[in-house]
């Protein structure tokens, strides 16, 4: 019995279906086919779980969280024992193993391993200003999304005719911050943060209004 090499890892957007491949070759009939799919969740590597089983010509549910979402892609028994997972969740991320036994065919590699990563687009980021908006001050524009896998990068832009930040601005795309030094009237305007990762983007807007000093009345 020989389980074929798997593609290594699969990425899928949250909520979308995933197909985890597992095929094998055997010299025996499929009368005594046993298949166990297991997962080692990334969130809890010490706690492997059963996903689905095929034993004695019957299918059995694995862990409750997979109930109604998991099944074999084809009619069993078969040499293609790939499974689908519908409505993928973040907690489905992990390392999946298919363990195949088909007596009397023993020996060879009877385990296939596939990694599953469930991706999440950035949630709507939160934009805020840190520091005084008085002329001549330094301000920091902050941007962060609560969700996003892979971790989003953040790009700040000024929504004016130049399509870019002023040269006095320093941007950190990982932290989502922009420091604008010595703000002037030219710094005023709408700024947009674009949070993006491999599967999506999300934006927020911030209106920076630089405050000019009020003329003092000398009485």
């Amino acid at each position: 019995l020989e389980v074929s090499e798997s593609p290594g890892s699969i990425q899928v957007a949250r909520g979308q279906p995933a197909v985890l491949p597992c095929t094998f070759t055997t010299s025996a009939a499929l009368i005594n086919l046993n298949v166990i799919w297991m997962v080692t969740p990334l969130s809890n590597a010490n706690q492997p779980e059963q996903v689905i089983l095929y034993q004695g010509g019957q299918m059995f549910d694995g862990a409750p969280r997979f109930h109604g979402r998991v099944g074999f892609t084809g009619t069993m028994p078969a040499t293609n024992v790939s499974i689908f997972i519908n409505n993928t969740q973040l907690s489905d991320t992990g390392t999946y193993q298919c363990l195949v036994n088909n007596l009397p065919d023993i020996g060879g590699r009877n385990i296939g391993v596939t990694g599953l990563t469930v991706l999440v687009p950035p949630s709507a980021p939160h934009c805020q200003i840190q520091g005084s908006q008085d002329i001549g001050s330094d301000v920091i524009l902050l941007c962060s999304s609560e969700e996003g896998i892979p971790r989003p990068t953040y790009l700040w832009e000024k929504l004016d005719n130049t399509l870019k930040l002023p040269p006095t601005a320093t941007q950190d795309q990982v932290q989502g911050t922009v420091t604008i030094r010595n703000i002037s009237a030219l710094s005023s305007g709408l700024y947009q943060c674009v949070a993006s990762n491999a599967i999506g983007t999300s934006t927020c807007l911030l209106d920076l209004q630089v405050i000019s000093p009020q003329p003092r009345n000398i009485g």
């Epitope: 990068t153 790009l155 832009e157 005719n161 130049t162 399509l163 870019k164 040269p167 795309q173 983007t201």
Partner: antibody, heavy 121, light 108 residues
Framework: EVQLLESGGGLVQPGGSLRLSCAAS????????MSWVRQAPGKGLEWVSA????????YYADSVKGRFTISRDNSKNTLYLQMNSLRAEDTAVYYC??????????????WGQGTMVTVSS | ASVLTQPPSVSAAPGQKVTISCSGS????????VSWYQQLPGTAPKLLIY???KRPSGIPDRFSGSKSGTSATLGITGLQAEDEADYYC?????????FGGGTKLTVL
């Protein structure tokens, strides 16, 4: 080395399509707004299209609006120009250009070598 | 026709000073910054001046820029043979960038 390298030019019939690419290297591509600028044989420079660092904002010259699409893939450090419904008057050398981060205004501080697009039957 | 207007050609002898004008409107030069480019034959343009009067590193101080109202001017002093090239002004307006038609500088 900081550079821009255009590709994808060639001969195309009127009404046809072409996709130009501009591969950037040596700088943080996503931090810069980028533009396409063209130059017809023996003529002056004409700005074609611009795109912000994130790709979220795009501008077009009236002469290409509705026919050309600018885009970028920051993961590949590449700028694109999809040109549809090409006309004879689109024949030109097409340059990609980087907008300076040192300037408050628009200033193209880095240019590619250009790629020739010829629209002819 | 270009949105920004430049003289088609100017000429001067080596060592002399020359100016190139660029005329626009309130929707471009009047309310925004101007850049200038030099294009030698068969090469890509090169940035000479940005933000009206600033020079990128490596550009000699023989080159200068100024702006007044809706017009801008490029000045070149101490003309050299290698300055013979096409010169372009550039500005921007609402969701668009604009170039001048270009000026051919001949060093006599």
């Amino acid at each position: 080395e900081v550079q821009l390298l255009e590709s994808g030019g060639g001969l195309v019939q009127p009404g046809g399509s072409l996709r130009l690419s501009c591969a950037a290297s040596g700088f943080t591509f996503s931090s810069y707004a980028m533009s396409w600028v063209r130059q017809a044989p023996g003529k002056g420079l004409e700005w074609v299209s611009a795109i912000s660092g994130s790709g979220g904002s795009t501008y077009y010259a009236d002469s290409v609006k509705g026919r050309f699409t600018i885009s970028r893939d920051n993961s590949k450090n590449t700028l694109y120009l999809q040109m549809n419904s090409l006309r004879a008057e689109d024949t030109a050398v097409y340059y990609c250009a980087r907008d300076s981060r040192d300037a408050y205004g628009v200033a193209f501080d880095l240019w590619g070598q250009g790629t020739m697009v010829t629209v002819s039957s | 026709a270009s949105v920004l207007t430049q003289p088609p050609s100017v000429s001067a002898a080596p060592g002399q000073k020359v100016t190139i004008s660029c005329s626009g409107s309130s929707s471009n030069i009047g309310n925004n910054y101007v850049s200038w480019y030099q294009q030698l034959p068969g090469t890509a343009p090169k940035l000479l001046i940005y933000d009206n009067n600033k020079r990128p590193s490596g550009i000699p101080d023989r080159f200068s820029g100024s702006k007044s109202g809706t017009s801008a001017t490029l000045g070149i002093t101490g003309l050299q043979a290698e300055d013979e090239a096409d010169y372009y002004c550039q500005s921007y307006g609402h969701r668009s960038f604009v170039f001048g038609g270009g000026t051919k500088l001949t060093v006599l």
